[in-house]
């Protein structure tokens, strides 16, 4: 048995008489042969649900639902009630009517073996029946909305009648009726003014059902039409097998360039025209078990359900069903040398469902876990100039698709063929598995015997100690020239362009600093500053080579304090900036400060 | 399989200033600096300068300054030569080329200039 | 800039027979334990092609009967013995100072 609400509205007046009936609670059933019994809970609740007092005024018919005073309530009774009310005015209080023998004892009061009856306090007595507007005499102020579960026997589920009006005014005349589409399985009965389903519902068919109710008064020669919206929702239960869409039941899948533990190497799909069982419960009772195969593959594989709420068309109206994700998840980073093509089964359970049929699907994964083989090109040519400073980027090595990795860890490392003149490093990136090359050694770029370097790059797999190998050759071009005095040692300090330009600074490739000329908009990433090379530096990022001295790009790499309008990097250095900003790597500061709009005047003035 | 595909030949005013592509296809763009060469009445090479995809890094002959203008689109990895101001001194076949040692190993099919009014 | 002179500006070869051009610096092209003189073949309506790469090194591709020696300022290339094919114009290049070319040598067959 269940409610087919769980909350009524009715109004109390003082001095109303004993005998007076409130309204009809209802109960649907879920099997043919139940019977209701209603029963009332001891206590009356008020604000914050504050246990007011024994409810001495109210009772309920047990058989039939009906609640009535059995005896007036009175001023004294009332203030009685609103002295216990935490302090604050007593204008609603409630009653839980529970469905016997569905709950014996008093405690929360939840939805489909309880619900709670509302009543909001007129302190005054039951108005003139002609004083009453037509809204008044037919709907309660709360709109009901109904809840229906499907695939249960019909019966009614609500009175349409206000009991205290029709009690208290029976000289008013007012009729109901239903205003439903054609075929729709509701009824209002004329003379009862009951409203039940003629058939059990089906959920999946139609979920929301948005009827009209109608009510016409008649009050002497006076005659009032009042419409409301009569809400229907019917409660889904467990009555869909799992299926697949399209009837995809094998999902295939390569491991190569992604490795990485928790990558997504293959995804299924069940459709579920259910939605039960609730969120909560989903995962604990849609379960997906790897189905024992050999170790390795239990060991190296996971499967991560995804539920997820989808609608679907049914009979011209939209419904609620489920989709459920099923992936296929790496549970470990993977070597390259590994090699092997697996069949893995997934046996997943609707465990709620009752059939017929079985609640049971088996999902095939045929994965292929192919080696990887480190290559690189078998040379590069790169050039470098002879005024390049230190950490000056000068190119990047990566081994074959090592943009594509994940979960392989790649090393790369610089062996010199001439001692005298190892003048590059290189550092691995971690972000795309590729080596960037930069100046180490200053000194030997100058020296006249190391006009060619002569490298070989090594790639090193760092689990299986595989490795790739390269020729790099860089030549040294153009001709050094010491730079002024007083130059600072990193590009950023410079604020204005004439002063960037003239010097170089950590991290240029050129043996100068360029300006980058900002927007002027404000707080923006394209702000003014002085680099050691716009491609690198700012980018909003602090790459493995800036990371290697504060002093090469503090606006990517700062963690000190940034002072001015900016936004701050993530997690660090300036993401964006107003005006021009320049920094201070060793005080750990940076400004971001207005352009000096007269500066490039006076620049060009004093030339 | 290594190609540097250039763009189509020119015919352009004195004065004029113009824009020569280079596209480069089989190899690892940013791994090799690139070349660009002059070559007037199919005889006489002189070598323009050089830039590093990588870094956008240039070295010029000294006689090309202000006249030649290098610069790549790493995203299409194609490199370009601007050529400025030009006069009919600059009538040539101009290449692009690979960088490999101090020699270059690839060029492209090159680039025919006609500057005439 | 460093002028490099190539000899002779033509040259008329029997097929199977020894070609040698010779280009000379005006200054030494020596650095880093190896001279830095390069020679590339041009054909008519093509772009040059590398044969010779740091004075002795053979490009890939290219056939073992083209040789290059030299040091300091004095470099040749030899073909031998010369094929039909090999009918084009001989450039050196170096790069001790820039790069610089020399006039060509145009091979021809007798």
């Known amino acids: 048995l269940y409610f087919s609400r769980d909350a009524y509205w009715e109004k109390l007046y003082v001095d109303q008489a004993a005998g007076t009936p409130l309204l009809y609670v209802h109960a649907l059933r879920d099997a043919p042969e139940e019977v209701p019994s209603f029963r009332l809970g001891q206590h009356l609740y008020g604000t914050y649900r504050t246990r007011l007092h024994e409810n001495n005024w109210i009772c309920i018919q047990e058989d039939t639902g009906l609640l009535y005073l059995n005896r007036s309530l009175d001023h004294s009774s009332w203030e009685k009630l609103s002295v216990r009310n935490r302090g604050f005015p007593l204008l609603t209080v409630y009653l839980k009517v529970f469905l016997s023998p569905t709950s014996l004892r008093e405690g929360e009061c939840q939805w489909p073996g309880c619900a709670r009856v509302y009543f909001s306090f007129f302190n005054t007595s039951f108005p003139a029946c002609s004083s009453l507007k037509p809204r008044e005499l037919c709907f309660p102020e709360t709109r009901p909305s109904f809840r229906i579960r499907e695939n249960r026997p019909p019966g009614t589920f609500h009175q349409f009648r206000l009991l205290p009006v029709q009690f208290l005014c029976p000289n008013i005349s007012v009729a109901y009726r239903l205003l439903e589409g054609e075929g729709l399985p509701f009824r209002c009965a004329p003379d009862s003014l009951e409203v039940s389903t003629r058939w059990a519902l089906d959920r999946e068919q139609r979920e929301k059902y948005e009827l009209v109710a109608v009510c016409t008064v008649h009050a002497g020669a006076r005659e009032e039409v009042v419409m409301v919206p009569f809400p229907v929702t019917v409660y889904d239960e467990d009555d869909s097998a799992p299926t697949f869409p399209a009837g995809v039941d094998t999902a295939s899948a390569v491991v190569e360039f992604k490795r990485k533990e928790d990558t997504v190497v293959a995804t299924l799909r069940v459709f579920d025209a259910d939605v039960v069982p609730a969120s909560g419960e989903l995962v604990r009772r849609y379960t997906s078990t790897l189905l024992p195969g050999d170790t390795w593959a239990q060991q190296t594989f996971r499967v991560e359900h995804w539920p997820n709420e989808t609608s679907v068309q049914a009979n011209g109206s939209f419904v609620r069903a489920t989709v459920h994700d099923y992936r296929l998840v790496l549970n470990r980073n993977l070597s390259i040398s590994e090699n092997r093509t697996m069949q893995l089964a997934v046996l997943v359970n609707d465990s709620d469902f009752q059939g017929p049929g079985a609640g049971v699907l088996l999902l095939h994964f045929n994965v292929s876990v192919l080696p990887v083989s480190l290559h690189l090109p078998s040379t590069y040519s790169l050039s470098v100039s002879r005024r390049a400073r230190r950490f000056a980027q000068i190119g990047k090595v990566c081994v074959e698709n090592c943009q594509a990795f994940s979960g392989i860890n790649v090393q790369y490392k610089l062996h010199s063929s001439g001692a005298n003149c190892s003048t590059l490093g290189v550092v691995t990136s971690a972000e795309d598995t590729s080596g960037i090359l930069f100046v180490n050694d200053t000194k030997a770029l100058r020296r006249p015997k190391c006009a060619e370097l002569h490298y070989m790059v090594v790639a090193t797999d760092q689990q299986t100690s595989r490795q790739a190998q390269a020729q790099l050759l860089v030549t040294v071009e153009g001709s050094y020239v010491a730079e002024e005095a007083g130059c600072p040692l990193s590009c950023a300090v410079s604020k204005r362009r004439l002063e960037c330009e003239e010097c170089g600074g950590l991290g240029s490739p050129t043996g100068r600093c360029e300006w980058r000329q900002g927007d002027g908009k404000g707080i923006t990433r394209n702000f003014s500053t002085c680099s050691p090379s716009t491609k690198t530096c700012p980018d909003g990022h602090c790459d493995v080579v800036e990371t290697q001295d504060i002093n090469i790009c503090p606006q990517d790499c700062l963690r000190g304090s940034i002072v001015g309008g900016h936004e701050p990097g993530e997690p660090r250095g300036i993401k964006a900036g107003y005006g021009t900003c320049n920094c201070f790597p060793e005080e750990e500061k940076c400004f971001c400060e207005p352009e000096d709009i007269q500066d490039p005047l006076c620049d060009e003035l004093c030339r | 399989e290594v190609q540097l595909q250039q763009s189509g030949p020119e015919l352009v005013k004195p004065g004029a200033s113009m824009k020569i592509s280079c596209k480069a296809s089989?190899?690892?763009?940013?791994?090799?600096?690139m070349n660009w060469v002059k070559q007037s009445h199919g005889k006489n090479l002189e070598w323009i300068g050089l830039?590093?995809?990588?870094?956008?890094?240039?070295n010029y002959n000294q006689k090309f300054r202000g006249k030649a203008t290098l610069t790549v689109d790493e995203s299409s990895s194609t490199a370009y030569m601007d050529l400025l101001s030009l006069t009919s001194e600059d009538s040539a076949v101009y290449y692009c080329?690979?960088?490999?040692?101090?020699?270059?190993?690839?060029w492209g099919q090159g680039t025919s200039v006609t500057v005439s009014s | 800039d460093i002028v490099l002179t190539q000899s002779p500006a033509s040259l008329a070869v029997s097929l199977g027979q020894r070609a040698t051009i010779s280009c000379r610096a005006s200054?030494?092209?020596?650095?880093?334990?190896?001279?830095?003189m390069h020679w590339y073949q041009q054909k008519p309506g093509q772009p040059p092609k590398l044969l010779i790469y740091?004075?002795?090194n053979l490009e890939s591709g290219i056939p073992a009967r083209f040789s290059g020696s030299g040091s300091t300022t004095d470099f040749t290339l030899t073909i031998n013995p010369v094929e039909a094919d090999d009918v084009a114009t001989y450039y050196c290049?170096?790069?001790?100072?820039?790069?610089?070319f020399g006039g060509g040598t145009k091979l021809e067959i007798k």
């Open positions: 080329a690979r960088h490999y040692s101090f020699a270059m190993d690839y």
């Open positions: 089989g190899y690892s763009f940013t791994g090799f600096t």
């Open positions: 830039i590093n995809p990588y870094n956008g890094v240039t």
């Open positions: 200054e030494s092209v020596d650095g880093y334990g190896s001279s830095f």
């Open positions: 740091r004075t002795s």
């Open positions: 290049q170096q790069n001790s100072e820039d790069r610089t």
